[in-house]
Amino acid sequence: AGVFELQIHSFGPGPGPGAPRSPCSARLPCRLFFRVCLKPGLSEEAAESPCALGAALSARGPVYTEQPGAPAPDLPLPDGLLQVPFRDAWPGTFSFIIETWREELGDQIGGPAWSLLARVAGRRRLAAGGPWARDIQRAGAWELRFSYRARCEPPAVGTACTRLCRPRSAPSRCGPGLRPCAPLEDECEAPLVCRAGCSPEHGFCEQPGECRCLEGWTGPLCTVPVSTSSCLSPRGPSSATTGCLVPGPGPCDGNPCANGGSCSETPRSFECTCPRGFYGLRCEVSGVTCADGPCFNGGLCVGGADPDSAYICHCPPGFQGSNCEKRVDRCSLQPCRNGGLCLDLGHALRCRCRAGFAGPRCEHDLDDCAGRACANGGTCVEGGGAHRCSCALGFGGRDCRERADPCAARPCAHGGRCYAHFSGLVCACAPGYMGARCEFPVHPDGASALPAAPPGLRPGDPQRYL
């Protein structure tokens, strides 16, 4: 067991252009507070829920009011450390999220308003018992400077807080075979109290005779990787050669919920239902009331004002968790059809539809030509969420409102001359050619190539194209 400690040194504008506006104003004074969330392992895809190692909330900082015209300075910070207690071994590698929250202190209807100013995250290696590690992280235009360390709670020592130490029984030296407990030189490493044979790499103990396994290991001595042990099926055929897979321990095995909390398995992790007066991922935090503002993301806190009275966070749509700390990405399954853009507004999902589509999920294909008139005898053609007009001869443009020059495209072949006409165009063909566009040569014997000239028109006559 031990404690992860976080010391915030400063939060303010980062270097470079684009300094952020101060989060507080004379009209709207505010104060800051911080939340830290820890989970074991270096993988961002770790199986644990958010904050599986624990989470902590800082006190509120001093009230701050911006001086008009002044750039945002480093903002006044809460006093003290953020402390995240851990019950089991320190994992050595961990991921963190540090959130900077703003509490507005103006005349709010329904109490203070909280909003997230910045969130930084990282993955680090850290041995328990080591010195403070310093860090700088940037989130947009903001910069957060902080230090952190993990320390073991006596009698635990070591880089994972799994070795136990006891005060020396004699002033001069430790007993036979026992080493001094660095860095606590006045203490001695306790005699082996774990169950005999308990794996030194994958097991640890807090009480004499026990053997508790680190994640991924199982068996009485923590020597068996989860889900690969060979066993005899307790209810199946009793053949000594039958190998089977034992499901690994569930997240509620050993009840990770402190202070009498009850554990239930969730789809990927666990959830503690805490008794009155306790909260946190493992019910490890006590004495929190609505006055402490435990509900995030605009959650409404309901409960008594005294520490023994439980509180409940009523979360707005899009958030869940006992403190409304989990965001649900409701756009993830692409609810908007036909290429619509999904917007999760928190209180509702909204789809921004492409042209030609409508409906709450862009599911309706609009009649592109409905209510669309094409001028001058043009006809409307639907297609792909837009409409276009097929214009009559002599007209053009999106709605056939523009008068076109029918001769602009030089439609008369073989040197024929083009004349604009009220109903289209007329080609006057050069000698030896005929047809509406002068496209057919006239044979020397006077017969024309197909198609035959319409009756009443001699080759060479102007051909009016209707």
Partner: antibody
Framework: QITLKESGPTLVKPTQTLTLTCTFS??????????VGWIRQPPGKALEWLAH???????RYSHSLKSRLTITKDTSKNQVVLTMTNMDPVDTATYYC????????????????WGQGTLVTVSS | DIQMTQSPSSLSASVGDRVTITCSAS?????MYWYQQKPGKAPKLLIY???NLASGVPSRFSGSGSGTDFTLTISSLQPEDFATYYC?????????FGQGTKLEIK
């Protein structure tokens, strides 16, 4: 196009072990957020969730059947295998596998694609 | 275990009717999921995260509710909607389904 297909024996004797394989295509269990679950439905009865497995090998088993169930995945073959020991006639049901999606760490977004199911009869 | 109770268990209605199916959880759940199943077929996801329409599901289907009480509504019943409907919770293990509501033609 996402598809899932269950395969395994249609008839199992009491006390035997049932092994069912779900072969899927159109998604990968190496992709963050993806999972595969098993659900069964006795004839004329309601659906019952049995187990599921996530991309990162996190597994869940129904409490009432935990001692009898094992779920494993073979990412390279796009397969998930469910074994159920000590079969009993009351285990006669259609067994379905389905894709589960979780875009938040602990919130299931949906169980959105299902196989057509395979009827398993337990009888001596 | 969280028990899911659907009502009614069966329902007769006509094409064009507005139909409401309710699902009550024995303890609070964050979200509800609804499935449609036709005889001899696999279930099909209709609604996820309480109110979101699954891909390909007509907009006459809608979901609502919070806490322990949730509702599936079909605004104007179509012939292809006659089926059995199930609700499900993903809050805690075991991840239970309702007993089903059979929607029949009147």
């Amino acid at each position: 196009q996402i598809t899932l297909k269950e395969s395994g024996p249609t008839l199992v004797k009491p006390t035997q072990t049932l092994t069912l394989t779900c072969t899927f295509s159109g998604f990968s269990l190496s992709t963050s957020g993806m999972g595969v679950g098993w659900i069964r439905q006795p004839p004329g009865k309601a659906l019952e969730w049995l187990a599921h497995i996530w991309w990162d090998d996190v597994k869940r088993y129904s409490h009432s059947l935990k001692s009898r169930l094992t779920i494993t995945k073979d990412t390279s073959k796009n397969q998930v295998v469910l074994t159920m020991t000590n079969m009993d006639p009351v285990d006669t049901a259609t067994y379905y596998c389905a894709r589960i999606v979780s875009f938040d760490n602990d919130v299931v977004s949906a169980m959105d694609y299902w196989g057509q199911g395979t009827l398993v009869t337990v009888s001596s | 275990d969280i028990q899911m109770t659907q009502s009614p268990s069966s329902l007769s209605a006509s094409v064009g009717d507005r139909v409401t199916i309710t699902c009550s959880a024995s303890s609070s759940v964050s979200y509800m999921y609804w499935y449609q199943q036709k005889p001899g077929k696999a279930p099909k996801l209709l609604i996820y995260l309480t109110s979101n329409l699954a891909s390909g599901v007509p907009s006459r289907f809608s979901g609502s509710g919070s806490g322990t009480d949730f509702t599936l509504t079909i605004s104007s019943l179509q012939p292809e909607d006659f089926a059995t409907y199930y609700c499900q919770q993903w809050r805690s293990n075991p991840f239970t389904f309702g007993q089903g509501t059979k929607l029949e033609i009147k």
